[in-house]
Structures are given as C-alpha cells and as structure tokens.
C-alpha cells in the first residue's frame, strides 16, 4: 500500500521542516522537577517499541509505522547500557537496582550492590543501596508503585527492597536458614522498609497467611495466602495509617481514588501477576492506565510533589512465552498509561522518563508490505518452501519440529493471541537480550538524558532533577508554581 | 567475572555524577556547520552496536560492555524510523533516499520519490529528489563518498543517483528496454550526475568495458569490466578534472592523499565490494579508516567546507550471511573510522552524524557471564539438551537440520569467523529488521537530533546545519574560524 500523499516529496519535506522547527524550539528547562515519574516497560527493547507502534497505529486503521506512540512524543532520547555487574545480559532485579538506585548489582539480586551474592543471605547487610523513591519520601514527597505484575516482583521491588534473591516473594519462598539469618521476604519489606503511599498491582497471595482463601478464587487453594508466619500484611499496613485503604477490584479502586479521606492506598487485584490486558476482565480488574490515573489522583495532592513508578511488567512475560501478541498488546496498554499520565500532569513540573530494563531476542523482519499485519507472514517462502512470520525469536518455546522439520504457518494461525513465534533454539522461556534500550524523557532536566549512558544514570538524573540525595545542592531554580 | 571496584556503590555513583556533570555542561552550538559527515553503518541496528562494543572492549582486554565505542561518545542521540513508503522493513536504497535526500521512497529505488515504481524506468523522470551532497556541492563545498561496498551500491548511490532499480550497477545490469527509455546505470550516474571530489570503495568492474582485465585479478574473467557500451568511465572521469587521479591500491591511495596537486580522487580497490576487514590484504587494500583519512585530507582543503559520506557497508553483508563475526568486525572498523575522523576534524565546525539505514534480525541473549566471548555459548543447555550461542538470528542461512534435529555447537565452532549463527527460519539471506535505529550526533546543530524521528529528518538536519537548500535562510551564525 502506497499512500498517495507520500508519493509527493513535499509531504516529507514539509513534515521534516516541521520536525526541525520543533527541534529548534526545544528549550532545556532550568527548573527543578517537583514530580518524578518513571515508566518502565519490562523487556521493552527497541524492536518491541517499533512493533507496538505499528500495531497501535493499525488498531486505529492507519498503516502503522507513521503513527506516534505516546513515548515517541517525548523530546529527549538516550540509550541505556543494561548489563549487570556479572552478566552481559541482565535480569529485572539487577537492572531495577541500576535505574532505581543508581548502582549496578548482580543478576537476580535487588537493591544491593554487587558485593552481595545471589542467594547468599549473609551478603545482604551493609550492601543495601537506597532507591530514588526512598529518597523522595525522605524529602517529603508522596510515592507510589504501580505494576501489572505482582507488586513484589523484581522491578517494583527495586524501589523499596533489598534481597539477594528476587524470588523471595513471601516468607514461604525464603529458605529457613535465610529466615534465621534475618533475611526478609519482599512482601514484608514492601510494608516495613518505607512508607509507600500508593501500591497498585498484583500479589495478594504473598500478603496473607497460608489457608486464607482469595476473594476472587475462594475455592482455589493455590491462589490463597502463602505466608508461613501467620501474618496478615495488609492488616498490618492498614494499621500504620489512619487514612489507609485496601482494595482488590476495579470498582473499589475508582471509589478510593476519589475519596479525599484516603491518604494511603493498596490495591492488589490478583493473587499473583495481573492478567494480560487481552485476558483482563474490565469489570473486576483495572487496566494499567486506570491504576496510573488512580495513583496520580492521590499522589498529586501533596504540595511537595511525588515520585511514581509505573511498570508495564508483562511485556516481558509475553516475550518469555514467545507470544508476541501478548507482549505487544501489553506494550500498547503501557503506552496508553503514559498518555493518560501526560494528560494528568504538566511537563512544567514533572520529569517523566520512559525506559526498559532490558530487551528480548525478538525481531521484526522479512520485508512485509506496509500496512500488513505485524503478526502476519513475510512475502514469499523460506528455503524449506514454507511460510514464515515477520516476527521471530532468537530462542524460546516457539521452536517446534514436526516430523523432523520446521512447521508451516498460516496467516490465521500467526494472528492468534496464543500463537508462539518460532525461534532458532528451543528453550522453556525465551531469554532477555543484552542490547541497549531507549530512554525517553520529558519535563524539567529531561535534556540531561542524552547520548549513550549506563543504566544507573537514570536514577541519578531523577535524583538531580528533584534535588534529592546526593544532589540536594542541585542549584536548580524551584519549579514554577511551587507551593513548598 | 565481577570486577572488585564495581562492587562498591561509590564506583557507580561517582561515574554517574561525572556523566551528569558532562550532561549539564552540554551547550547547543548556535553556529552553522562548515563541514558535514554522515557515517552510515549499513544494517547496524542497536543490537549490532552493543555486540560490537563488547567485542571492541574485549579486543582491548576489557570485559566488554563497560567500554566506549567512538560513536558512544557522541553527545546527542535520536531514534530513526526506517520504514519505506511501501514496506515496513526497508532496503538500503529507499533508506538512502530518506537520510541523504530527505524524502522517503519505495523499496529498492534510489534518489526518487515514492511516485517512482521499482523497475519501471518510465516512472523515473520528474520524480528525482536531490541529495544533501548535491546541494553541498552547489554551495561550493567539496564532497566525497567512501564505502567498503562497491561505490555504486545502494547506500552511496543515494548521494548522487536516481534509479528505479538499485541493482543497475552497470549498463549490463539494465534491461535493453530501460536503456532505450533513457535510464542510466548507477556507474554512469556516478561520474555524470554531479562533480564528486572523492570516491573511494569497491566497484571497479562496473567502470570498464567488458573484456577489460582487472589489475588485481587479471586472469579472472568474472572480475573484469562488465560494461556493454564500451565506455571506460574512469577515463571519462579523469578527463573532466585536471587534478583528478585514479588509484586502485592502498599505496597509491596514501600517496595521492598527500599530493597537493590532486584535487579529485577516485580509488576503486576491488572489482565488486571490498573485502571483509578480516580478509583484507593490508598491503593492497586500504581499511575504511584509511580511506576516511585520505578523503578528509583532500576534502578539508576547501575553505568552504565539505560533505562526506562514509559507509561501513559490509556490516550488512555479514548479517545477511548470518556470520556475526564478520558483521561485528566490520562494525569495529567502521567505529575506528569514526574515531579517526574525530581526530582529524573539529566539532566546532563539523557536524558528524552516525546512523544505520536499517537493522537486522540479530539478537544477543542467553544470560552469558560478563567477560565471556560475544561469540560464545550461553550457560546451560537448550530444551533439546544441546548448547546454543548467545548470538542468534530470527531468519537466515544459519538454519540447519542434522538428522532431523538442531545441530549441537561447541565454543570453538561458534568462535570461528566462518560460523553461521542459527536461525528460526531457513533463508538464503538473512533479512533486514524494521525496528528504529539510533542516530548519534556531534557538532554544530547536533542538538537538533533528538527524540523519535522519521529517517528523512537526518538529511534535513544536515541541510539546515550547513544552511543548504531549502534552508539557506537558516539564520545561524557562521562557524568560528570560517574563511569564506
């Protein structure tokens, strides 16, 4: 498909001249940021961004790549080097430590320097590193964590926890020896390490004692409470704050977010991770966009500002399953949340960053025609005279041999939300990829986001922009309209 | 491998604070660019950049990812949307039209708007678009094209040619019907469309009549001249300029570049594409770095400045072969050329851009240990109980079934320069990928390179920075030290 207007050079020349005009008008703001928002697309490498852009465009009846994601509109871009201290290709724990605490750690550890060793409890103490969220709280800001995964998952945990094992969600996951040495599960740290004003996502089961039925799955024992210590962490958290409220469904969330008496809000909408967007029951579970809006309504009441972490956490899960449909629809909802946040905040006083913790071995090739489905087939056949999809994985569970050969695929098969794209190597879970990821920035001090940087730079930019530790002597003018 | 110094949070905090300090010091230059250099890494997607960084670092006995490529030091980064008007995943012809002429075209066409149709000669006339190089020449600057491919290849041809078929290298490649309609081969256009001061790369055979033996391969008929029109285009080109010189080996190139009587230089060092860097005979063929240096020595004599196109063109070829070793060693040489150019020019008066025309379905995953070979194996085994490499392709010629199963691989096999990484789908040639590529910028007006842009933006930034058409009223201060 060739759009007629694009045949005319004037179309491109005019468009570029406009882009140039916008670039010339860009003025670095010399003010401090009152508010900080970091949007984390878990596993959202550049190939995922592009494919999601095309899909989002096509859902709006456009050809695809010419459209804009909300993140595409952010004026500043950098590349972030995601390796962990011990691995070329990192996990979401070590990377969370980097972009949230400003220090690189080791694979599968969270909130700890690289002096800590995976799974070795006794290497925890003394190696804790403090997140920007924690520093924001100490500076009097309100803080929040919003995710589509369980709230105790690696990425959000980087904002509040310190653990040598990212899988220690509840005490039932922590070996007895580690518990005896004083290592706390992540759920416990969620409510005890610091005061978090808004906590929204999944992860109910880690908060309740073993045997507590789940309100949504009362007959499913596997979805009920997992704790061995008998603690009801939700109850403990509610007891800490007079204006605290706990909700577990969408209706309650929307009510709470509009209730001026609510000062602290915890919403846990699934026992584990939240549902994929394509599987979400919108009558019970809020979308990432809705959770983001609810969080912003509460946090923005603080005249000193806020710090908010928003994670599209299941982009990563879709890729691990080699189900690009899931990964890309998650990315679109993540982008929708970015768009809504932009409508609810001002770039005069809010520094917004969008980035990924790492990428995936996910590619988009094969010379498909413009306007063709992102989930479709490449033109022509492969060397084995079979069709192949434009989306493919380097490794993962999509590798199948049928009668000793690669299976054929049809357009209707490849378009199914359940379809697993093929891969070169068979793995139970497709792996992360180690290439640089993009950082998109808008708002005060966003111009500092430039060039190729270590992933740790992200935390430092946020801290500097809001004059948080260690940059309290930041020498930035207070933002316009500050009330503090 | 965990470097001891990296275990200390101070290491990361100090490093980030320094990066922040550098970011704060960045001052957009308000001057015009006297010189323009565009470095084009053909097929150099972000995954290629990262893998090459690790390899370059490891060649210097470092662990890898913590090191810097020359391009990593460029202060400004943007993302470029590479689709062509008719394809989600483009080729090097349509993309060359975008970043060199500022207008998007159709797959496999060059220097033409999208009103032109592939292979249809009669859609050429009236749809030509003019490159920034051409405009620079008209403004009195010297201009040059340097590539490791044949100089008539798609990317360099974007600087000077207009053709509905990128494969029309010499008249022997052009169908008789198209020749009768007046469509010229690219080699003819190279010497007749505009006055190019420096032309360095491969592509000898397209310049000479059929039957002309090649000086380097005199007994190999397939390497000799291909032209049917009996023309010796090198001779014709030499006749146009009193100070013109033609060279075909490294020694002659180095001599000519230092000879003040040489005003125009054509160096064609292979009949077709130049050798891969790992196969290059350094006594006969210059490296990309040496060609770049030679070009800069000549071009920088012009007080009005210059435009230079430098292409690492065989990064792409290595990937098409699914031979990552070739692609990455080509990328390192490309980066070396960028580094050398930086030493020979000043960012006060020279706008340098580094980008790719498109990416490849090339990924780097599998959680390898830091410091392990980029060509090595992932830890653990795949689901088929066999080893697998960290580098893989989505599609390509590395797909092999041995006795109806995926072949095993050893570290020594995977480290071979000839090894083809496995792929999910068997193709004769691995395909391009459609995700956004990076644009790195340094020098006057480099700050305009920001955010997510259409690939066409690159040409417009160059034109604006140097006050070329259509931005002659650019309202920029002349660069410091101008002599014009």
């Amino acid at each position: 498909i060739i759009p007629v207007e694009e045949e005319n050079p004037d179309f491109w020349n005019r468009q570029a001249a406009e882009a140039l005009g916008a670039a010339k008008k860009l003025q670095p703001a010399q003010t401090a940021a009152k508010n900080l928002i970091i949007f984390l697309g878990d596993g959202m490498g550049v190939s995922t961004v592009t494919a999601a852009r095309i899909l989002k465009g096509q859902k709006k009846d456009k050809l695809g790549p010419e459209t804009f994601l909300a993140m595409d509109r952010f004026p500043y871009v950098a590349l972030s080097k995601t390796y962990s201290v011990d691995k070329h290709v990192p996990d979401s724990g070590a990377t969370a430590t980097a972009y949230l605490c400003g220090v690189k750690g080791n694979f599968q550890t969270i909130g700890l320097s690289a002096a800590a060793r995976f799974n070795q409890c006794n290497t925890t103490r003394g190696n804790e590193v403090i997140s920007v969220m924690n520093r924001a709280k100490k500076a009097g800001k309100s803080v929040g964590v919003v995710t589509t995964t369980r709230v105790q998952h690696a990425s959000p945990a980087g904002a509040y926890a310190h653990t040598v094992n990212r899988n220690w969600y509840s005490d039932a996951d922590v070996p007895a020896s580690a518990r005896q040495e004083g290592c706390q599960d992540i759920a416990t740290q969620l409510i005890s390490n610091m005061d978090i004003d808004v906590i929204l996502g999944g992860g109910r089961k880690y908060m309740f004692p073993m045997g507590t039925p789940d309100p949504e799955y009362p007959d499913d024992y596997s979805q009920g409470g997992t704790r061995l210590d008998g603690k009801n962490l939700v109850q403990e958290w509610l007891a800490k704050h007079q204006g605290a409220r706990y909700v577990w469904n969408r209706t309650e969330l929307l009510q709470a977010s509009l209730d001026p008496s609510v000062t602290h809000l915890m919403g846990l909408f699934e026992p584990g991770d939240m549902k994929y967007e394509i599987h979400r029951d919108s009558t019970l579970d809020p979308s990432l966009m809705e959770m983001t809006e609810a969080a912003l309504l509460l946090l923005s009441r603080n005249p000193r500002g806020f710090f908010l972490f928003v994670e599209g956490g299941r982009i990563d899960h879709g890729h691990h399953e080699s189900r690009a449909y899931r990964a890309l629809t998650e990315t679109i909802m993540f982008d929708d949340a970015i768009e809504r946040a932009g409508q609810l905040t001002s770039e005069e006083d809010t520094l917004s960053l969008v980035t990924a913790d790492h990428s995936h071995v996910f590619s988009f090739g094969g010379y498909p025609l413009r306007g063709s489905s992102i989930f479709g087939l490449a033109p022509g056949k492969a060397r084995d005279r079979k069709a192949y999809t434009v989306l493919l994985y380097g490794n993962g569970p999509g590798y199948v041999l049928k009668d000793g050969a690669r299976p054929d695929v049809t357009e209707s098969e490849s378009g199914s939300p359940e379809y697993r794209q093929q891969s070169a190597v068979p793995l139970d879970g497709e792996t992360h990829a180690g290439e640089d990821v993009a950082v998109f920035a808008r708002g005060p001090q966003a111009h500092l986001v430039h060039g190729v940087q270590e992933q740790t730079f992200i935390a430092h930019v946020m801290a500097f922009a809001a004059c948080l530790e260690p940059y309290t002597a930041c020498d930035l003018a207070p933002r316009a309209g500050t009330t503090d | 491998i965990i470097p001891v110094e990296e275990e200390n949070p101070d290491f990361w905090n100090r490093q980030a604070a320094e990066a922040l300090g550098a970011a704060k010091k960045l001052q957009p230059a308000q001057t015009a660019a006297k010189n323009l250099i565009i470095f084009l890494g053909d097929g150099m997607g972000v995954s290629t950049v990262t893998a090459a960084r690790i390899l370059k670092g490891q060649k210097k006995d470092k662990l890898g990812p913590e090191t810097f490529l020359a391009m990593d030091r460029f202060p400004y980064v943007a993302l470029s949307k590479t689709y062509s008007v008719d394809k989600h995943v483009p080729d090097s012809g349509a993309t060359a039209t975008a970043y060199l002429c500022g207008v998007k075209g159709n797959f496999q066409t060059i220097g033409l708007s999208a009103a032109a149709r592939f292979n249809q000669c009669n859609t050429t006339r009236g749809n030509e678009v003019i490159s920034v190089m051409n405009r620079a020449k008209k403004a009195g600057k010297s201009v040059g094209v340097v590539t490791t491919t044949r100089v008539q290849h798609a990317s360099p041809a974007g600087a000077y040619a207009h053709t509905v078929n990128r494969n029309w290298y010499s008249d022997a490649d052009v169908p008789a019907s198209a020749r009768q309609e007046g469509c010229q081969d690219i080699a003819t256009q190279l010497i007749s469309n505009m006055d190019i001061d420096v032309i360095l790369g491969g592509g000898r055979k397209y310049m000479f009549p059929m039957g002309t033996p090649d000086p380097e391969y005199p007994d190999d008929y397939s390497q000799g001249g291909t032209r049917l029109d009996g023309k010796n285009l090198v001779q014709e080109w030499l006749a146009k300029h009193q100070g013109a010189r033609y060279v075909w080996n490294r020694t002659e190139l180095l001599q000519a570049s230092l000879d003040p009587s040489v005003t125009h230089l054509m160096g064609l060092f292979e009949p077709g594409d130049m050798k891969y860097e790992i196969h290059r005979d350094s006594t006969l063929d210059p490296s990309l770095m040496e060609m770049t240096e030679a070009a800069l020595l000549l071009l920088s004599r012009n007080p009005r400045g210059f435009f230079l196109f430098v292409e690492g063109g065989r990064i792409d070829h290595g990937h098409h072969e699914s031979r990552a070793y070739r692609a990455l060693t080509e990328t390192i040489m490309f980066d070396d050329a960028i580094e050398r150019a930086g030493q020979l020019t000043s960012e006060e008066d020279t706008l340098s851009l580094v980008t790719a025309d498109h990416s490849h379905v090339f990924s780097f995953g599998g959680y390898p240990l830091r410091g392990s070979s980029i060509f090595g194996l992932a830890p653990g085994k795949a689901r088929d109980r066999k080893a697998y490499t960290v580098l893989l392709y989505g599609n390509g010629p590395g797909y092999v079934l041995k006795d109806g199963a995926r072949p095993d691989v050893t570290e020594s096999e995977s480290g071979s320069p000839e090894y083809r990484q496995q792929s999910a789908v068997p193709l004769d040639g691995e395909t391009h990928a459609g995700e956004d590529v990076a644009v790195f910028a340094r020098g006057p007006q480099a700050h305009l390179v920001h955010g997510v842009q259409e690939q066409t933006f690159i040409a417009h930034v160059m034109a604006f920075a140097a006050c070329l058409e259509p931005y002659t009223a650019c309202d920029l201060a002349p660069r410091a030290g101008t002599t014009d």
Epitope: E216, D219, D220, L254, H279, T283, S287 | -
Partner: antibody
Framework: QEQLKESGGDLVKPGASLTLTCTAS????????VCWVRQAPGKGLEWIGC????????TYFASWAKGRFTGSKTSSTTVTLQMTSLTAADTATYFC??????????WGPGTLVTVSS | QVLTQTPSSVSAGVGGTVTINCQAS????????LSWYQQKPGQPPKLLIY???TLASGVPSRFKGSGSGTQFTLTISDVQCDDAATYYC????????????FGGGTEVVVK
Amino acid sequence: QEQLKESGGDLVKPGASLTLTCTASGFTLSTYWVCWVRQAPGKGLEWIGCIDTVSSGDTYFASWAKGRFTGSKTSSTTVTLQMTSLTAADTATYFCARRTGSRWTLWGPGTLVTVSS
Amino acid sequence: QVLTQTPSSVSAGVGGTVTINCQASESVYNNNYLSWYQQKPGQPPKLLIYQASTLASGVPSRFKGSGSGTQFTLTISDVQCDDAATYYCLGAFVSNGWYFAFGGGTEVVVK
C-alpha cells in the same frame, strides 16, 4: 432502585433491520458490561453478545451473530443492539443484562421480537 | 466453547435433593467464571451462584455450587415447591476475545 429495561421489540418482516435499546435507571453503566441474551419461544437462553461499557467499548459477539448483529454504547445509561437481515429464526424475547465478573446480577424483563411475513 | 448441561429434566419430591451437572468443552475463565441462573416462565433469569460456588445475595443456602475448570455442579438440597423452574449454567471464556455460553437448561419438576 436499579433497573434495566429493553425497548424496540416489534413485529418485522424477514430481511428487515431492527434496533433494540437497553436503558439503565438508578445506576450508570461505567462499572458493568451490558450483555444481550435471547430466548426463542419454549427454548433455552442463547448468548448474543456483550459490550465493554467499562473501558474500551469493545464488543464481543457469538460467532453466529457476527456480521448481522452489532452493539454500541450510546450514553452513560443506554446501549443498543442493531440487528440486520432478520429471519424467522430470530423470533425471540431479547434480554439485556449487566455483568460484573462472573455475575449477571440484573436483567431486564425482555422485549419480544417477532419476524414474520 | 460449549456447555453441556445434564440432565435436561429432573423431578424431585419436596425435601429431596437435585444435582445438575455442567461440563465445559474447555476451561472457563479463571477456572471459576461459571454462574447458575433460575428462570421461571415469563420472567428473566435470576442469579443464584457465581464464581462457581459463591451464593448470590438473598439466595437460600440450600443452593450450592461446586467445581472448577470444566466440571461444575449445582446441588439443590431440601427442595421446595418454589424451586420448580428451569436452571441454566453460564460460562465465560477468553481466547481471541471474550465468549460466553449457556448450558441447554435443566427443568426441575417438584412433586
């Protein structure tokens, strides 16, 4: 008091089109889906489709209904069901119901559609 | 996605027990998006059980739902005359979008 009421049922000829409306009173549709169900005389309940009136506005229809039946939210308290190319087999009482999770808690009394020449 | 309800008709004496089965051709959403409805002639259906086993408000505890995944049961104990009606199961499924299906219905006759 919360209620749903269907309207628009009629006697129509084969091949005709008809639009049914479901009107909510005492509440808005922003936290529920609205689903359509029909029941031919003396037969069981048959799901037609649902409208996500909560967030996306997406519609989901039974495979047999796709193409002939469409639904839309027309206000915060009304949704419509458009039916085309009606045949005698479409003669039934048409119900709308509100859905939260696995609960279809509130149903309208139904409206009768008769297709006959 | 099909829900097979058995039996199609059942009779019981007052005070007796009725068991109705509902089998899904694939797992329902969340393994528990199965609800039961009672319909009397000339009336719309009335919700009895949701989430496979949770009693709707105002419904007597004589009605009990059980099951998970693909197999579900509605048990009416201490049957009363007022329980004479047709009972339907309703399942929700998600694959390529949402899909709902009713069982064929079970007529309960009270003697």
